[in-house]
């Protein structure tokens, strides 16, 4: 079942998927100036049996003014600069998704690729949440929405996370150092924070994840 | 289960100081920021100040900047904060609340007066 | 002065649904932040009521329910009893102060 709408918009924060599951779907989209070939795919599938999952189709663009180029090459290094990427700059990435079963690694760049990609998720994906450049997060950890089916309806969960601007600086004289904390994600206690909206962190996903505060207690 | 208990309230001079201190306990303190929030009496709730999981940044109300500190001792899963200067209008009860906040504890009463 | 308005209050009689209104700004609501209702009886803490926009925390009855859209959100509340009596904040994080923005509050008197 594909979920109804995109994963939900976090200011200051940009979201990733580690992994597809299976019936997800890739658009395949050409960067301006290309085409897809006349008889290429629409999208890219991601399918797969019990023990192993992989693209079908193959996205394959053309110049607009050229009929009949249809080579496919990957990408030179200044054209996947080119790719608007996602992908988290953080020491804390989660368990790697993609080697559990049903699921599809993100696919290979194809030539002359459009500079955003466009997913259609299927119920059951999650995806993950991380302040860009110059902003932090207020909670540690990943952030996490995962499109769910209530009541015959999909939605998606909202990821607990606040990403805030420049530091203030506020150590006053005599104020102690703030201390360093270990990355990574932190045991949990007894319970779980709610911090499960903007000023939090949410789920647990394998051993290393840690749920909100209360918020896990509440979805 | 959570548990948030508020201490170091009670009567001070205006000018004085006082040191407000929040004992966590039932969650992992470590991975939350924290907040101060306080309610004068009859009042609304006004959020004071603002502090990362790790103490690494801190935000503060307008109409404390200057005169409250906030802290976290993460080893001692405790947050404080220092008010220097303090004025009536700083009367309130004061609340220490954890993530959204989504929980609060039971609060500590300062009055300043002479 | 507020950052985020609120009726200072609301009544109802039991069994009647009751709306609270909140407004932001765009530096809050209408930033794309979460919004979260608090409800506070009298003489304790505020107490977590609706967490992002729309959820209910375990043990919150599906009498309460929030919505967003735009620069502003409410809350409702069906089904009026009279333990409903209490004061109802909303809260919001703004990216101008990067803090939590409060509501003045809303008094519900059940009549």
């Known amino acids: 079942e594909l979920c109804d709408d995109d994963p939900p918009e976090i200011p200051h924060a940009t979201f990733k998927a580690m992994a597809y599951k299976e019936g997800t779907m890739l658009n395949c989209e050409c960067k301006r100036g290309f085409r897809r070939i006349k008889s290429g795919s629409l999208y890219m599938l991601c399918t797969g049996n019990s023990s192993h999952s992989s693209w079908d189709n193959q996205c394959q663009c053309t110049s607009s003014a050229t009929r009949n180029t249809t080579k496919q090459v990957t990408p030179q290094p200044e054209e996947q600069k080119e790719r608007k990427t996602t992908e988290m700059q953080s020491p804390m990435q989660p368990v790697d998704q993609a080697s559990l079963p049903g699921h599809c690694r993100e696919p290979p760049p194809w030539e002359n690729e459009a500079t955003e990609r466009i997913y259609h998720f299927v119920v059951g994906q999650m995806v993950y949440y991380q302040c860009v450049q110059g902003y932090r997060a207020l909670h540690r950890g990943p952030a996490e929405s995962v499109c769910k089916m209530t009541h015959g309806k999909t939605r998606w969960t909202q990821p607990q996370l606040i990403c805030t601007g420049e530091m203030e600086t506020s150590q006053f004289p005599g104020e102690e150092k703030p201390q360093a904390s270990p990355e990574g994600r932190p045991e949990s206690e007894t319970s779980c924070l709610v911090t499960t909206t903007d000023f939090q962190i949410q789920t647990e996903m394998a051993a290393t994840m840690e749920t909100s505060i209360f918020t896990t207690e509440y979805q | 289960e959570v548990q948030l208990l508020e201490s170091g309230g009670g009567l001070v001079q205006p000018g004085g100081s006082l040191r407000l201190s929040c004992a966590a306990s039932?969650?992992?303190?470590?991975?939350?920021?924290m907040h101060w929030v306080r309610q004068a009496p009859g009042k609304g709730l006004e959020w004071v100040s603002v502090?990362?999981?790790?103490?690494?940044?801190?935000y503060y109300a307008d109409s404390v900047k200057g005169r409250f500190t906030i802290s976290r001792d993460n080893s001692k899963n405790t947050l404080y904060l220092q008010m220097n200067s303090l004025r009536a209008e700083d009367t309130a009860v004061y609340y220490c609340?954890?993530?959204?906040?989504?929980?609060w504890g039971q609060g500590t009463l300062v009055t300043v007066s002479s | 002065q507020s950052v985020l308005t609120q009726p200072p209050s609301a009544s109802g009689t039991p069994g009647q649904r009751v709306t609270i209104s909140c407004t932001g700004s765009s530096s809050n609501i209408g930033a794309g932040y979460d919004v979260h209702w608090y409800q506070q009886l009298p003489g304790t803490a505020p107490k977590l009521l609706i967490y992002?926009?729309?959820e209910r925390p375990s043990g919150v009855p599906d009498r309460f329910s929030g919505s967003k859209s735009g620069t502003s959100a409410s809350l409702a509340i069906s089904g009026l009893r009279s333990e409903d009596e209490a004061d109802y904040y909303c809260?919001?994080?703004?990216?101008?102060?990067?803090?939590?923005?409060f509501g003045g509050g809303t008094k519900l008197t059940v009549l």
């Open positions: 809260a919001a994080w703004d990216q101008s102060l990067n803090g939590p923005v």
């Open positions: 039932g969650f992992t303190f470590s991975s939350y920021g």
């Open positions: 609340a954890a993530g959204v906040p989504d929980y």
């Open positions: 502090i990362s999981y790790d103490g690494s940044y801190k």
């Open positions: 992002s926009n729309n």
